[in-house]
């Protein structure tokens, strides 16, 4: 028998630094977790004390926080390098910056191999692209060879920016002619490391022939045996086991997100390379791992470009960005106006004719929005200005929901309406009228949305049997200020760009704004 | 059906350097590793280098580690081995070999070229 | 480094016979065991992999057996084209090493 180690992340998303328990900003460094120099130490002490690892990434990398902001991706080719990692998977956010800004900064400069066998270049793109990423990968390992076949998530024409020349096939129509390929070059443990979300992790297990084991990303998963370390709750056991259609137990595993646990799987294959057994879990990256001292002087040298960027300006505001939450808690506010027409911009994707784009829809929790910003500073604005309007390092998400479950979800807004809660709606491409004199449950008396299968935008009302694209924050799509609803009755969830990037980049593109208070909620007469 | 034609073999003085190419043909080149194995006149076989099918990752016996330098060009289906530094004890057929299975199956070798090392 | 040691240097037999060729290595190998056949002006040629897989083409009077440091090359029956000299060939961390050889002539 022959034993292999895989050490996994998933979805770091830009957490460089350490962070706080819930994976924003370290604040008290003592609590703090992950990053990199902490994920190097536990990295190398599993390297001396086994003889066959690798450490895999499945994508989702790009996009989180203002490393990725200010360097593009330059920064997470030079500390994956650092900690020489064996392969990576493209995920959807790694063409946030279009397919440019993934070849210049990463495909470039990694020394690992870049994986995913269900993208497809064609056009002028094919020969600019060719073999800067690859379908699958075969590593020696100890005195053995692995086979690792990328896959990425086909709804990435949706969620970033891959242009018009990369297809995005079916993951496990795509995967098995390059597993078939690796078992006739007699490679016999093959690896599916990709970005596609748990439930096609298990399927891709399920049905393709030939894969030993998947290591996945996208849907954050947290798997766990036992008593769990931290916060996250676990959705099932690591590794999680299918049974595949040709009867063999095929191990899946994620690592939950944003670096804050490294996977940790060991698998023993037979002389055959069949899977004769296999454990492991997540490993919390808390304060017990020292940070490696000499990436850590690293990430502090990186670290000073940051702090100057966050001072410069991104663009200017002739009006009052009006954040109070005497405003956006209780009525319209030109900030909430603001921060749904950049999610809305920051979503443009022109996928289909029919279609003048795919989402016409935000809203957004008033009491997410912390603080305003005066414009008689200049009108400039600042990223260490919209840090304190967006303070919590979230992102802002894609859903599916049904009619019904947005008009629950507007029925909440006002429920209690008049306390100063957070749960008042804030929204984009979406006109809502309130009668507060009916009782709670019952307040919402018009509700229009935007159409997308239209050449001219208009307002329809909203039908409760239809299925809505809707932008919103993480914090809602997670069922906080209380829109269980969402949670509950999503249909789809795919996690977005970081909140403050999104705002930083539409503000810079617009260069001088002036949003107003133009009437998408109102009251009716008499009732307010 | 495979084939392996080396050249590039010839007398160099010792400390000179020397060139080999390997034409490869019937085969999907950039799937396998391929090796050089080299033969003294009148012994046996002694390996000399390993190029993984993309060139990712090369290996060299102790012999020859910091003189030769194994690549490929997959676009052209050539083999090379760059020999500097060269001895007498360098001497040898140089074979060109295909690895079918991960350094377990070298499984097609090409006819070999003469080096010969010698003031 | 792993050193091959083969035995005998020479083996000689008449047509028909068995040929038993010995192999071991410093240390264990595993499976990763090779034996070549080499006729004198001409490339080597594969016979066994993996210490007991017969090579594509290669007749069933060959088979190789052994694990770890101690392995066999068997000829059945010695046909005249079988008299060569026979290497046996190991890999343990993609570096490889080919025993000194085991002429088989005619006796």
């Known amino acids: 028998a022959w034993e292999l180690t895989i050490l996994h992340t998933n979805d770091v998303h830009s957490r460089l630094e350490q962070t706080s328990e819930d994976s924003s900003k370290c604040v008290n460094a003592s609590r703090c977790m992950g990053g990199v120099a902490r994920l190097f130490t536990k990295v190398q002490q599993i390297r001396r004390a086994e003889p066959n690892v690798l450490l895999l990434d499945a994508g989702d990398q790009y996009q989180g926080t203002i490393w990725f902001t200010v360097y593009k991706g330059a920064e997470v080719a030079h500390f994956m390098n650092a900690l020489r990692y064996d392969a990576m998977a493209l995920g959807n956010h790694e063409f946030d910056n279009g397919v440019e800004g993934l070849i210049e900064p990463l495909l470039k400069e990694a020394k690992f191999p870049i994986l995913s066998a269900n993208i497809k270049a064609k056009g002028p793109l094919a020969s600019q692209i060719s073999g800067l990423y690859l379908p699958y990968k075969v590593l020696p390992v100890g005195d053995e060879v692995v086979g690792i076949v990328g896959y990425t998530s086909k709804e990435t024409p949706f969620l970033s920016n891959p242009g018009t020349n990369l297809v995005f096939e079916d993951e496990i129509t795509a995967l098995q002619p390059e597993v078939d390929k690796l078992k006739t070059l007699n490679v016999n443990k093959i690896i599916a490391l990709g970005h596609s979300g748990f439930e096609m992790d298990k399927l891709i297990a399920q049905k393709v022939r030939g894969v030993d084991v998947v290591v996945g990303g996208h849907s954050n998963t947290f798997l766990y045996t036992g008593n769990p370390p931290s916060k996250e709750v676990p959705a099932g056991k690591y590794p999680f086991i299918v049974t595949s259609d040709d009867g063999r137990k095929v191990p899946v595993v994620q690592a939950y997100a944003f670096g804050k646990y490294l996977g940790y799987l060991k698998i023993e294959f037979d002389e055959r390379g069949n899977v004769i057994s296999s454990h492991g879990n997540p490993i919390l990256l808390n304060s017990s791992i020292p940070e490696d001292p000499s990436i850590k002087a690293d990430i502090n040298k990186w670290r000073i470009k940051l702090d100057n960027y966050s001072t410069q300006e991104l663009g200017k505001t002739i009006v009052y960005l009006d954040g109070s939450s005497q405003s956006c808690r209780f009525r319209e506010c030109n900030m909430g106006n603001l921060i749904c027409d950049a999610m809305i911009n920051n979503n443009l994707r022109h996928t289909d004719e029919m279609f003048w784009n795919h989402v016409s829809m935000c809203i957004l929790n008033g009491g997410g929005i912390r603080s305003p910003i005066d414009e008689r500073n200049n009108g400039t604005i600042t990223w260490e200005n919209l840090a304190a309007v967006l303070p919590f390092g979230g992102t802002f998400d894609l859903v599916q929901l049904k009619g019904s479950t947005l008009k629950k979800a507007f029925e909440h807004s006002v429920h209690r309406y008049g306390q100063s809660t957070g749960e008042f709606l804030q929204v984009g491409g979406i006109h809502v009228v309130y009668d507060l004199s009916r009782k709670p449950g019952d307040r919402v008396v018009k509700l229009d949305v935007l159409c997308t299968k239209c050449r001219v935008p208009s307002y329809d009302p909203l039908k409760m049997d239809e299925v809505y694209k809707v932008i919103l924050p993480n914090f809602l799509a997670n069922g906080g200020d209380g829109f269980q609803m969402i949670k509950d009755e999503l249909l789809r969830h795919d996690s977005g760009d970081q909140d403050i990037n999104v705002v930083s980049t539409y503000i810079s593109k617009m260069k001088v704004i002036y949003p107003a208070v133009e009437g998408r909620i109102k009251f009716s007469t008499g009732s307010h | 059906q495979v084939q392996l034609v080396e050249s590039g073999g010839g007398v160099a003085q010792p400390g000179r350097s020397l060139s080999l190419s390997c034409a490869a043909s019937g085969f999907t080149f950039s799937d396998y590793g391929m090796h050089w194995v080299r033969q003294a006149p009148g012994k046996g076989l002694e390996w000399v280098a390993l190029i993984w099918y993309d060139a990712s990752f090369e290996y060299y016996a102790d012999s020859v580690k910091g003189r030769f330098s194994i690549s490929r060009d997959n676009s052209k289906n050539t083999l090379y081995l760059q020999m500097n530094s060269l001895r007498a004890e360098d001497t040898a057929v140089y074979y060109c070999?295909?690895?079918?299975?991960?350094?377990?199956?070298?499984?097609?070798w090409g006819q070999g070229t003469l080096v010969t090392v010698s003031s | 480094k792993i050193v091959m040691t083969q035995s005998p240097a020479t083996l000689s037999l008449s047509p028909g016979e068995r040929a038993t060729l010995s192999c071991r290595a410093s240390?264990?190998?595993?499976?990763?065991l090779a034996w070549y056949q080499q006729k004198p002006g001409q490339a080597p040629r594969l016979l066994i992999y993996d210490a007991s897989n017969r090579a594509t083409g290669i007749p069933a009077r060959f088979s190789g057996s052994g694990s770890g440091t101690d392995f066999t090359l068997t000829i059945s029956s010695l046909e005249p084209e079988d008299f060569a000299v026979y290497y046996c060939q190991q890999r343990s961390n993609w570096i490889f090493t080919f025993g000194p050889g085991t002429k088989v002539d005619i006796k």
């Open positions: 070999v295909r690895d079918a299975q991960w350094g377990s199956r070298l499984d097609y």
């Open positions: 240390q264990s190998v595993s499976r990763y």
